[in-house]
Interface confidence: low
């Protein structure tokens, strides 16, 4: 008899999922030698046990601890780059500022990084057909659940001058739904963060307005503000440019506005 | 349309070499990582190297690491993989793939977009 199985409005778990994140621990921990003496088969033990036979709208932080203990990871706190709405970019970044990093440069970042998974309630078995969505099903689903636990240990850990990455080309360039704006906006820690700097990204070749006077932006600074954390802003009118001059800051044309 | 076309591959002894090219267009080549992998007759398709979007990042099969180089030109959109010292287990067909990203993740689950391959034959 075939069994009924709920479905979801998003899609299933990405296939090969469990192949998948093994074979991503294993190359991390080969790429970075500080993490050499991470065990990938207890990594991918912690990551099934947090969702595997649990409702998959019934999700909690604490199903995801002996994760975050295994992915335990120290990054220079002065060098964390989080970004908004604009992924590539932000690891375009720091691929060539090697000593900054996003959230998907930490190794628990890595591997869940473009993943979707589920499972199902009292079954071993990992939900390939679909997987909740989080506006239409519920909030408190594995994928959602997990990248909240790890960017507010991420936002945590931040100190000094924090840097965000925004999208300049949306409506809002400040979403104060997204991640950035519901997680890690709220978990930097005034004790230890003095600045958080954005960049707005130009979209346009010929878009010279000052979008740090964006009403978002402004939103965004009201908060910032208010947890005693100092605001500043840069536009960065030529990510193309941007890229190459944090490559070779001693061009002669790096001297210009960027 | 995005394309991606191997050339290069060929007949050679044990010990020799080969330069593969892999001419890319329809996107923006210098925007993302690429690969290259291989499949052997009978065999599952096996990863070979990768190469970070602007070329600062290489990384290899343990198979071929100190052997072949994986590099690329940005302004011509071509990526290459020079083999040297050529044994008869490389005989295969190689393909360059694009990655979806700038190379955040070296496995082939992020591949989406691949060439048609290129034969490398090695015998005596």
């Known amino acids: 008899v075939p069994r009924w199985r709920q479905q979801w409005s998003g899609p299933g778990t990405t296939k090969r999922f469990p192949e998948t994140v093994l074979a991503r621990c294993v190359k991390y921990t080969e790429i970075h030698p500080e993490m050499r003496h991470v065990d990938c088969q207890s990594v991918w033990d912690a990551f099934k046990g947090a969702f595997i036979s649990k409702h998959p709208c019934n999700i909690t932080e604490e199903d995801y601890q002996p994760l975050m203990k295994l992915g335990t990871q120290t990054v220079p706190c002065n060098k964390i780059l989080l970004w908004s709405r604009i992924k590539d970019l932000a690891h375009q970044f720091t691929q060539v500022q090697r000593d900054m990093f996003t959230l998907e440069d930490t190794l628990l970042g890595y591997l869940a990084d473009d993943l979707t998974w589920c499972g199902e309630f009292n079954t071993s078995k990992i939900n390939y057909q679909s997987c909740p969505d989080w506006r239409k099903d519920c909030s408190n689903n594995p994928v959602s659940v997990f990248w909240k636990t790890v960017s507010r240990r991420f936002a945590e850990a931040a100190c000094d001058v924090v840097h965000v990455m925004l999208n300049g080309s949306r409506s809002k360039i400040f979403d104060k739904n997204s991640t950035f704006g519901s997680v890690e906006v709220h978990n930097l820690q005034p004790e230890k963060v003095q600045t958080l700097e954005a960049w707005v990204i130009h979209g346009g070749r010929e878009d010279s307005r000052d979008l740090c006077q964006d009403p978002t932006i402004k939103e965004l600074e009201s908060i910032i503000s208010k947890r005693n954390i100092q605001f500043s802003c840069k536009n960065i009118y030529r990510p193309d440019k941007f890229l190459q001059c944090v490559k070779n800051p001693e061009d002669s044309s790096c001297t210009s506005e960027i | 349309q995005v394309q991606l076309v191997e050339s290069g591959g060929g007949l050679v002894q044990p010990g020799g070499s080969l330069r593969l090219s892999c001419a890319a267009s329809?996107?923006?080549?210098?925007?993302?990582?690429m690969h290259w992998l291989r499949q052997a007759p009978g065999k599952e398709r096996e990863w070979v190297a990768v190469?970070?979007?602007?070329?600062?990042?290489?990384y290899y099969a343990d198979s071929v690491k100190g052997r072949f180089t994986i590099s690329r030109d940005n302004s011509k959109n071509t990526l290459y993989l020079q083999m040297n010292s050529l044994r008869v287990e490389d005989t295969a067909v190689y393909y360059c793939?694009?990655?979806?990203?700038?190379?955040?993740?070296?496995?082939?689950?992020?591949?989406?977009?691949w060439g048609q391959g290129t034969l490398v034959t090695v015998s005596s």
């Open positions: 793939a694009k990655d979806r990203g700038t190379m955040r993740v070296v496995v082939y689950d992020t591949l989406d977009i």
């Open positions: 329809g996107f923006t080549f210098s925007g993302y990582g």
């Open positions: 190469i970070s979007y602007d070329g600062s990042n290489k």
